[in-house]
Amino acid sequence: TTPEPCELDDEDFRCVCNFSEPQPDWSEAFQCVSAVEVEIHAGGLNLEPFLKRVDADADPRQYADTVKALRVRRLTVGAAQVPAQLLVGALRVLAYSRLKELTLEDLKITGTMPPLPLEATGLALSSLRLRNVSWATGRSWLAELQQWLKPGLKVLSIAQAHSPAFSCEQVRAFPALTSLDLSDNPGLGERGLMAALCPHKFPAIQNLALRNTGMETPTGVCAALAAAGVQPHSLDLSHNSLRATVNPSAPRCMWSSALNSLNLSFAGLEQVPKGLPAKLRVLDLSCNRLNRAPQPDELPEVDNLTLDGNPFLVPGTALPHEGSMNSGVVPAC
């Protein structure tokens, strides 16, 4: 017997659907109507036939009461080929729901997204996460998607993007966006970061994550942030192969005074990089290749320094820096 495609936990909290049959019974998903967090994985199916069964241009207000009764707060949709028109239809209907967090992963969006009709209500998301989503419209995808969202988005995460650079002139500002995560885009690089950080479109960013994004030097990142007018409080550059030295011909970059936390863990560093901010509250240099304790003049003024997992640190060694947070135990790096 084939397993049920959808499973609802005994508390009506989490519902997970895995539709792997070539012609799945989509009605099985109705058991998720009472769940708060819903995950729907479509097994790589092409959802084009859906367009024949639904009227994508129908007034979504007719579904408003039905959709308002959904408890869903967080929705994940994955592994499908989705016509842009169908995605838009779903977003229009979900605008009447309580949905706050939307995750799209392993999707291929085909066709172009129509413009937002004047009477349409945008989706009031606080968090949008995209992983391995390709768009037929290339660089303009963010601007097209953005028009279907209300301007209160707080968290935006874009991983394994096929086009991590955006068409900046078409993108409107994200006035409430405090967290931007571009991690897991290894081809991004510092030049790509400059293209992705559309100037003055991200005025409220506090947390910027750039793990595994092909960054080369903290100074190069500093320059990209300065060019975009982005002043994060927290910057995560972990899991990049960073060079400690700076290109002598590169202009010196002044870090924003707003930056107080910098993560440089798992960055292959053999020495403390040059050109770090002069003052930080938190600096994480764990799991690098530092062969000796950093000298005070190599480090910024820092309250909380983490050096765990570096070769020079043997369990039981005296702490190398006042106020450091080393456990004395080498973590699994």
Epitope: E11, D12, R14, S34, E37, R71, R73, E101
Partner: antibody, heavy 115, light 111 residues
């Protein structure tokens, strides 16, 4: 059988940050469910503070949202509450609880806000 | 926010009596076929204990003298034959919509 245990200081000074940790045994906090903090001022009713879900998603009571952070440490199977800028009105028994129908409760810990 | 109003705020009854506590919601707590309204018992110095979930389902280990009914905005907790150990404060709670809210409580005493 899931068990929850709150820990943290019983006395916090006004304007400081209240920090509590809930250690969960018998169940992984990343499996499913919501992991909540609920409080009860002495002699009063119950108030939901917020949750962190199995996925790491959070939801907070709007009345406390500007002061509350709920986070988790999956390696220790723990989740934590931070409530900033506390006043005497935050004096309460704080419970950690599993689910949205609150079937599993810690025994509660009294936190007094006083100078 | 959904407000829950319990009545009465307190009541005194004799052992063996049938006791009814009501809970009224300011808006529906139903989502399709389910009512997300739950009942708890709290004894002094103890954490609350779930009695009834989703309006009418008896939580495992709870005596069968406890029952619940209702839908949308009006709900009832019934104790068919009051026992001395039932002295406690009873709360209703909704989990249909955040913020998840509780009623103000009903204090039950023995005459």
């Amino acid at each position: 059988q899931v068990q929850l245990q709150e820990s943290g200081p019983g006395l916090v000074k006004p304007s400081e940050t209240l920090s509590l940790t809930c250690t969960v045994s018998g169940y992984s906090i990343t499996s499913d469910s919501a992991w909540n903090w609920i409080r009860q001022p002495p002699g009063k009713g119950l108030e939901w503070i917020g949750y962190i879900s199995y996925s790491g998603s959070t939801s907070y009571n709007p009345s406390l949202k500007s002061r509350v952070t709920i986070s988790r440490d999956t390696s220790k199977n723990q989740f934590s509450l931070k409530l900033s800028s506390v006043t005497a009105a935050d004096t309460a028994v704080y419970y950690c609880v599993r689910g949205l129908r609150f079937a599993y409760w810690g025994q509660g810990t009294l936190v007094t806000v006083s100078s | 926010d959904i407000q829950l109003t319990q009545s009465p705020s307190s009541l005194s009854a004799s052992v063996g009596d049938r006791v009814t506590i009501t809970c009224r919601a300011s808006e529906s707590v139903d989502s399709y076929v389910n009512s997300f309204l739950h009942w708890y018992q709290q004894k002094p110095g103890k954490a609350p204990k779930l009695l009834i979930y989703r309006a009418s389902n008896l939580q495992s280990g709870v005596p069968s003298r406890f029952s619940g009914s209702g839908s949308r905005t009006d709900f009832t907790l019934t104790i068919s034959s009051l026992q001395p150990e039932d002295v406690a404060t009873y709360y209703c709670q909704q989990s249909n919509e955040d913020p998840y809210t509780f009623g103000q409580g009903t204090k039950l005493e023995i005459k």
